[in-house]
Interface confidence: medium
């Protein structure tokens, strides 16, 4: 309970993109679905689908911010071959520019809110997961927030 | 040095359609998009829409959903854009210009315009 | 779609001294503590040119003459002080949201 209360702060406190987020179209879960086969299953903030398959909870808001952020970071770190400052801030100009503009919108709202810390994350050579994790876009495998 | 040249002036008739191009170069053209903006005699800017000239996608201001369309040949480096049905108001300078940031939306890099006058 | 106001449309100004460009949006244009507002230089006959940044980020290549400052709706482009290659015509544009927008203009002359 503790657990679920503390997941609708963090959501609250995350502002609201979901806004955008729950609009998305088939091609932004096929670009984000590439991304997540090990991924996913660690993540405790990726809900399942509500019976009626239309109802969206904070955590499944919060499990699509954490779809998206996997996907822009992957895709930053093949990107650049060697994680710096430069190369990574270089790269992060241009990360959101393949795919539809809806997936556009969607990773420039993202960037324009994380990029800072994404950059610092790779550059310290923390994994896609950990950088997600820490921007509080799901609870970290670990244990509880 | 970036540069983006765009076609020379134009003079066409009412009804009629006009493709205007933006070489660029000095840069991987592929890695920015291209903006169109629309400046009418004595008039502010107007913006047209973009396109991503690495996969051709493109995001356009409704206003001008139907009247521009913009398309980009990678082995040349250019961008164009196609207006159609021309009337009196299209009459106007149209620039094209780089968008140096992707997630940001300033234009960094201007062409130098391309005038199209629509008259009988 | 978000419109911008430029106030004053016109302004002379002695060299040397301050000008101050306002630029008011009708709707914030604020994203996660970024603002997405930009100033342009455009002189006759020639295409506009990128001055300011995401509000207050100078372009490279542009004198330290230049500034900007505000957020949420109201911002300002100061030249201080102005020179006689300044007089030009100043807009605002917002890239917060679609469709990106620009203010009507100040054209800046010199007394």
């Known amino acids: 309970m503790a657990t679920w209360a503390l997941l609708l702060l963090a959501a609250m406190l995350l502002g609201n993109p979901g806004l955008v987020f729950s609009r998305l179209s088939p091609e932004y879960y096929d670009l984000a679905r590439a991304h997540l086969r090990d991924e996913e299953k660690s993540c405790p903030c990726l809900a399942q689908e509500g019976p009626q398959g239309d109802l969206l909870t904070k955590t499944q808001e919060l499990g699509r911010d954490y779809r998206t952020c996997l996907t822009i970071v992957q895709k930053l770190k093949k990107m650049v071959d060697k994680p710096t400052q430069r190369s990574v801030s270089n790269a992060a100009t241009r990360v959101c520019r393949t795919g539809r503009s809806r997936w556009r919108d969607v990773c420039r709202n993202f960037m324009r809110r994380y990029q800072s810390r994404v950059t610092q994350g790779l550059v310290a050579g923390e994994t896609a997961q950990q950088i997600c994790e820490d921007l509080r876009l799901c609870i970290p495998s670990t244990g509880p927030l | 040095q970036v540069k983006l040249q765009e076609s020379g002036p134009d003079l066409v008739k009412p009804g009629a359609s006009v493709k205007i191009s933006c070489k660029a170069s000095?840069?991987?053209?592929?890695?920015?998009?291209i903006n169109w903006v629309k400046q009418r005699p004595g008039q502010g800017l107007e913006w047209i829409g973009w396109?991503?000239?690495?996969?051709?996608?493109?995001k356009y201001n409704e206003k001008f959903k139907g009247k521009a369309s913009l398309t980009a040949d990678k082995s040349s480096s250019t961008a164009y854009m196609l207006l159609n049905s021309l009337t009196s108001e299209d009459s106007a300078v149209y620039f094209c210009?780089?968008?140096?940031?992707?997630?940001?939306?300033?234009?960094?890099?201007w062409g130098q315009g391309t005038t199209v006058t629509v008259s009988s | 779609d978000i419109e911008l106001t430029q106030s004053p449309t016109s302004l002379a100004v002695s060299l040397g001294q301050r000008a101050t460009i306002s630029c008011r949006a009708s709707e914030s244009v604020d994203s996660y503590g970024d603002s997405f507002m930009y100033w342009y230089q455009q002189k006759p006959g020639q295409a506009p040119k990128l001055l300011i940044y995401r509000t207050s980020n100078l372009e490279s290549g542009i004198p330290a003459r230049f500034s900007g400052s505000g957020s949420r709706t109201d911002f300002t482009l100061t030249i201080n002080p102005v020179e006689a290659d300044d007089v030009a015509t100043y807009y605002c544009?917002?890239?917060?949201?679609?469709?990106?927008?620009f203010g009507g203009g100040t054209k800046l002359e010199i007394k």
């Open positions: 396109i991503d000239p690495g996969d051709g996608s493109t």
């Open positions: 210009a780089r968008v140096g940031n992707d997630y940001d939306g300033g234009f960094d890099f």
């Open positions: 544009q917002q890239s917060n949201e679609y469709p990106y927008t």
């Open positions: 000095g840069y991987t053209f592929t890695n920015y998009d």
